[in-house]
């Protein structure tokens, strides 16, 4: 009752390997690393056959098939390139994930290289089977912002893509009779979050308490350059409106807020986030130059439709920007204390502008980003948000614009966005 001699499958082996096999002898068929036993179109690690009483084997010898990791998972905001010819996805094949540059960058500078493992999964040395993450690049406009050496007083037209983080925030409260509507600016922090000033998103119907406007009343425009032409802009409704819990309407302390967009916006040359500073109570150093952009929306009688479609003359059609120096804190405090009124420039604020006054202190819309170029990371960092001191005092001598000191709120911002700071490789200032 001897069974016929067995030939191991190509790329496989049989155990035990004997010269002769008799009734009730069993053999285990297995495959080399990177191959799987294939029997009746079913993949398995091993297959057992037995020598029967009549001298035949209980089954035919299966084949060994090379492991196939199949098409790799798609990476959001990323691309896949195959290292092997014919886009092979079998054992030891290599692929490389990359992010859609220059708008996204791979988290932790990962190589993005994945190899098809013997187990049939794409594996990376660091991340294992997890896919890499493409994070939005921040603070790197597709156009170079102008050199900050020469001082500019007054506004200049911004070229498209110069301030890709600039957002126009439109609040239209249709529950009021008549409809209440107003505007402000904001800065894109990620594909889903806008940073702005709390006072832009506060309902003025209540003065005794701070109540945010309803998210249904908020629309955000990104990639907007000329308000007469919104065709190239992305508009998004709000999923959440988050005011800083300590925002004080008496003195605008903690004047900072976030809007979470209903859907992440696609990034591109005209829509890119700005970088957050590192947590630093000092804020930007005195005399550093920063830029603020805005459409100069200060006329209270402008309607949303006029702003978004007709480009009324009461505001700049084209995004304007201005260059302003940071003012020493003591000087700014003194300038406000010397005037009648209980204005307080707190440690959560800093000032910018020129002693001699001028139009420059008016150009930034409320909530707009005061950005400073960080030489170390070669990126633009949002150090301030247009808070107060204008427009009602606009252009007066020794009346500086007051900005929310963003570096005091970095932890709060990350917390609201639901991202641990360590994940994001924060850009550092100075």
């Amino acid at each position: 009752n001897e069974c016929p001699e067995l030939q191991p499958p190509v790329h496989g082996k049989i155990e035990p390997s004997q010269a002769k096999y008799f009734f009730k002898d069993q053999v285990l068929v297995s495959c080399d690393t990177g191959y799987k036993v294939l029997k009746d179109n079913v993949e398995m690690d091993t297959f057992q056959i037995e020598c029967l009483k009549d001298g035949t084997w209980s089954n035919k010898i299966p084949t060994c098939k090379i492991v196939d990791c199949r098409a790799p998972g798609e990476l959001e905001h990323g691309l896949i390139t195959f290292s092997t010819r014919n886009n092979l996805t079998t054992y030891k094949s290599e692929i490389k994930y990359s992010c859609q540059e220059p708008y996204y960058k791979m988290l932790n500078n990962n190589t993005g290289i994945y190899t098809c493992s013997a187990q049939g999964v794409w594996m990376n040395k660091v991340l294992g089977r997890s896919l890499p993450t493409c994070l939005p690049e921040c603070g790197q406009p597709s156009r170079s912002l102008p050199s900050l050496v020469k001082r500019i007083i007054g506004g200049r037209n911004a070229e498209p893509g110069l301030f890709p983080w600039q957002a126009l925030i439109v609040v239209e409260d249709t529950s009021r009779v008549p409809n209440d509507k107003w505007f402000g600016s904001g800065a894109l922090l990620s594909a889903s979050w806008i940073l702005t000033a709390a006072h832009v998103l506060r309902s003025q119907r209540r003065d005794t308490t701070v109540i945010p406007v309803s998210k249904e009343h908020v629309t955000v425009y990104l990639g907007l350059h000329d308000v007469r032409d919104k065709s190239g802009a992305v508009n998004s409704s709000a999923a959440r409106v988050v005011l800083h819990p300590d925002f004080n309407i008496q003195n605008y302390n903690h004047d900072i807020a976030l809007v979470q967009l209903q859907e992440p916006v696609p990034l591109g040359p005209h829509v890119m986030p700005v970088c957050l500073p590192r947590l630093e109570p000092e804020g930007p150093a005195p005399h550093m130059l920063g830029l603020v952009a805005g459409w100069g929306i200060s006329n209270p009688n402008v309607t949303v439709d006029e702003i978004i479609s007709s480009g009324t003359r009461t505001l700049s059609d084209v995004l304007q920007y201005v260059k302003l120096p940071v003012v020493p804190h003591a000087e700014c405090k003194t300038s406000y204390e010397s005037r009648s009124g209980n204005y307080s420039v707190t440690e959560n604020m800093f000032c910018a502008g020129y002693y001699e006054g001028g139009k420059d202190t008016c150009l930034g819309d409320s909530g707009g980003a005061f950005v400073i170029f960080d030489d170390l990371s070669q990126r633009w960092v949002v150090q301030g948000l247009v808070s107060w001191g204008g427009p009602e005092e606009c252009g007066s001598k020794q009346v500086y614009g007051v900005y929310t000191k963003v570096s005091n709120y970095v932890d709060w911002v990350w917390e609201q966005m639901g991202l641990p700071q360590s994940v994001v490789e924060p850009q550092v200032e100075r």
Epitope: V171, R176, P178, N179, D180, K181, W182, H199, Q204, R205, R206, D207, T208, T209, I211, I249, Q250, N251, Y252, N299, P300, N301, S340, G341, N342, Y343, W388, E392
Partner: antibody, heavy 116, light 112 residues
Framework: QIQLVQSGPELKKPGETVKISCKAS????????MSWVRQAPGKGLKWMGW????????TYADDFKGRFAFSLETSARTPYLQINNLKNEDTATYFC?????????WGQGTSVTVSS | DVLMTQTPLTLSVTIGQPASISCKSS???????????LNWLLQRPGQSPKRLIY???KLDSGVPDRFTGSGSGTDFTLKISRVEAEDLGVYYC?????????FGGGTKLEIK
């Protein structure tokens, strides 16, 4: 420190127009709405409505829709109340008060007398 | 509109004695945000009004603690523990919960 200073008394004829100002100082002007309140001689207070100093949008109580208009000159930190086509029953003292609902600081009042 | 009814119309009090003014609204003043926007102000003779109390019981800065506000829903009270000469004038309650905001008719506090 916080002050609301209103324009002086007005003597007008029926059918004329009056515009009252309320200069605000000592606080961030666009942070608070501004209410307008009427007090007829020997009578109580009546809320006329308010203006959002950030958006510039006015809201009127029903009795004050039509001939009454709230406006702003933000750069001068000054809200205005204009009454068109004055009637004898508009004779009253008009107050501005800081806040859409808070009304925590009040102007000194502007007396408007309508008489032929 | 919400009707605000103040009682009494006039209150004659001896200096040093307590005083109490009632204010009733025709509907609850509890707002959807959980707060009750009921306020009190004083208009001294020949002067502009001055707010004393907001959100039912919170005292404005500079207001003596002999003034207290209380109540909820539709019934509110302003109490003065010991009346002083400077307290004379007309007291108004007003609500800022339901549009349009409405004032009570006023209570004149006079010194006996």
């Amino acid at each position: 420190q916080i002050q609301l200073v209103q324009s002086g008394p007005e003597l007008k004829k029926p059918g004329e127009t009056v515009k009252i100002s309320c200069k605000a100082s000592g606080y961030i002007f666009t942070s608070y709405g501004m209410s307008w309140v009427r007090q007829a001689p020997g009578k109580g207070l009546k809320w006329m409505g308010w203006i959002n100093t950030y958006s510039g949008v006015p809201t009127y109580a029903d009795d004050f829709k039509g001939r009454f208009a709230f406006s702003l000159e933000t750069s001068a930190r000054t809200p205005y109340l204009q009454i068109n086509n004055l009637k004898n029953e508009d004779t009253a003292t008009y107050f501005c008060a800081r806040g859409g609902e808070a009304m925590d600081y009040w102007g000194q009042g502007t007396s408007v007398t309508v008489s032929s | 509109d919400v009707l605000m009814t103040q009682t009494p119309l006039t209150l004659s009090v001896t200096i040093g004695q307590p005083a109490s003014i009632s204010c009733k609204s025709s509907q609850s003043l509890l707002d959807s945000d959980g707060k009750t926007y009921l306020n009190w102000l004083l208009q001294r003779p020949g002067q502009s009004p001055k707010r004393l109390i907001y959100l039912v019981s919170k005292l404005d800065s500079g207001v003596p603690d002999r003034f207290t506000g209380s109540g909820s829903g539709t019934d509110f009270t302003l109490k003065i523990s010991r009346v002083e000469a400077e307290d004379l004038g007309v007291y108004y309650c007003w609500q800022g919960t339901h549009f349009p905001w409405t004032f009570g008719g006023g209570t004149k506090l006079e010194i006996k």
